[in-house]
């Protein structure tokens, strides 16, 4: 008789999840000499230990502490790029501007990027059928708690000028319910962070509006200012040109507004 299995509203664990995490860890530690000491089998064991045999709606930050410990990594605190709803461009940017880092450029972020995972209470099985959805099922699920934990640490690590890339094509350019709006903004340390600089990325080629005047950006400015951190904002009207100019700053067309 097949055992009854909880049906969640979200997609199940990414196929070949253990192999993917292990392979990513090996690849990352080969590329980043400062992380060569990391034992990837131990990393996988710690990752697995965070959610296996646990109810997938009852995961805590403490469950991830062994993994976080193994994934300790120094990032240049004045070279941090946060993003919200515009991950691909943020990653394209840090691939060119190699001295800047998104969370997914760190080991822990790289391991988990775009993956889903969960287990089942009291069994050692990984659930490949379904996992809890943050809205429809529960917020304390393995994926959400992981990203909340590492995002908090990443924001706490930041200093000097912190940059955030925001999607100007969305109805809420700054969304208080995003990871950036609900976690990272509130964990920037005012004693260390002087300025948060927002880059609002425009979608349409003919869009010449000043999206820094958007009400949600003004809301972000208000939250940041109340935290004793300065705020500045720039429109990136042409993201394609922006990336091109990061690659080739000497290009004569890069002196004009992008």
């Amino acid at each position: 008789v097949p055992r009854w299995r909880q049906q969640w509203s979200g997609p199940g664990t990414t196929k070949r999840f253990p192999e993917t995490v292990l392979a990513r860890c090996v690849k990352y530690t080969e590329i980043h000499p400062e992380m060569r000491h990391v034992d990837c089998q131990s990393v996988w064991d710690a990752f697995k230990g965070a959610f296996i045999s646990k109810h997938p709606c009852n995961i805590t930050e403490e469950d991830y502490q062994p993994l976080m410990k193994l994934g300790t990594q120094t990032v240049p605190c004045n070279k941090i790029l946060l993003w919200s709803r515009i991950k691909d461009l943020a990653h394209q940017f840090t691939q060119v501007q190699r001295d800047m880092f998104t969370l997914e450029d760190t080991l822990l972020g790289y391991l988990a990027d775009d993956l889903t995972w969960c287990g089942e209470f009291n069994t050692s099985k990984i659930n490949y059928q379904s996992c809890p959805d943050w809205r429809k099922d529960c917020s304390n699920n393995p994926v959400s708690v992981f990203w909340k934990t590492v995002s908090r640490r990443f924001a706490e690590a930041a200093c000097d000028v912190v940059h955030v890339m925001l999607n100007g094509s969305r109805s809420k350019i700054f969304d208080k319910n995003s990871t950036f709006g609900s976690v990272e903004v509130h964990n920037l340390q005012p004693e260390k962070v002087q300025t948060l600089e927002a880059w609002v990325i425009h979608g349409g080629r003919e869009d010449s509006r000043d999206l820094c005047q958007d009400p949600t950006i003004k809301e972000l400015e208000s939250i940041i200012s109340k935290r004793n951190i300065q705020f500045s904002c720039k429109n990136i009207y042409r993201p394609d040109k922006f990336l091109q100019c990061v690659k080739n700053p000497e290009d004569s067309s890069c002196t004009s507004e992008i």
Epitope: Q65, G71, T72, T74, V75, P76, T106, A157, C159, K192
Partner: nanobody
Framework: QLQLQESGPGLVKPSETLSLTCTVS??????????WGWIRQPPGKRLEWIGT???????YYNPSLKSRVTISVDTSKNQFSLKLSSVTAADTAVYYC????????????????RGQGTLVTVSS
Amino acid sequence: QLQLQESGPGLVKPSETLSLTCTVSGGSISSSDYYWGWIRQPPGKRLEWIGTIYYSGSTYYNPSLKSRVTISVDTSKNQFSLKLSSVTAADTAVYYCAGGDSYGPVGQWPSDYRGQGTLVTVSS
């Protein structure tokens, strides 16, 4: 709970070397659970990171101070120290030792624990 306490002279003459010590209690300075550093706040200015030392022994220093700074650890006394050479009046500040929890992404500026600070004045 980790506690940190700075000690050292409150007055240093120009061109001399400023030496401060931080005593750690409630945790082992040689534990891989923590990393250690120094920060300072000149009168009327923002906090400034000076440098950091990790469990591995590797050090990171503020580029603007790098040529004058040394941070070291004495595990037998559960202490770490700061030496800042060739001081001028611009080095007058409240100096804080600090500790950070060593997990996940961490910056060079530890901010999880901090001492009460000690005022160092550079004057002849």
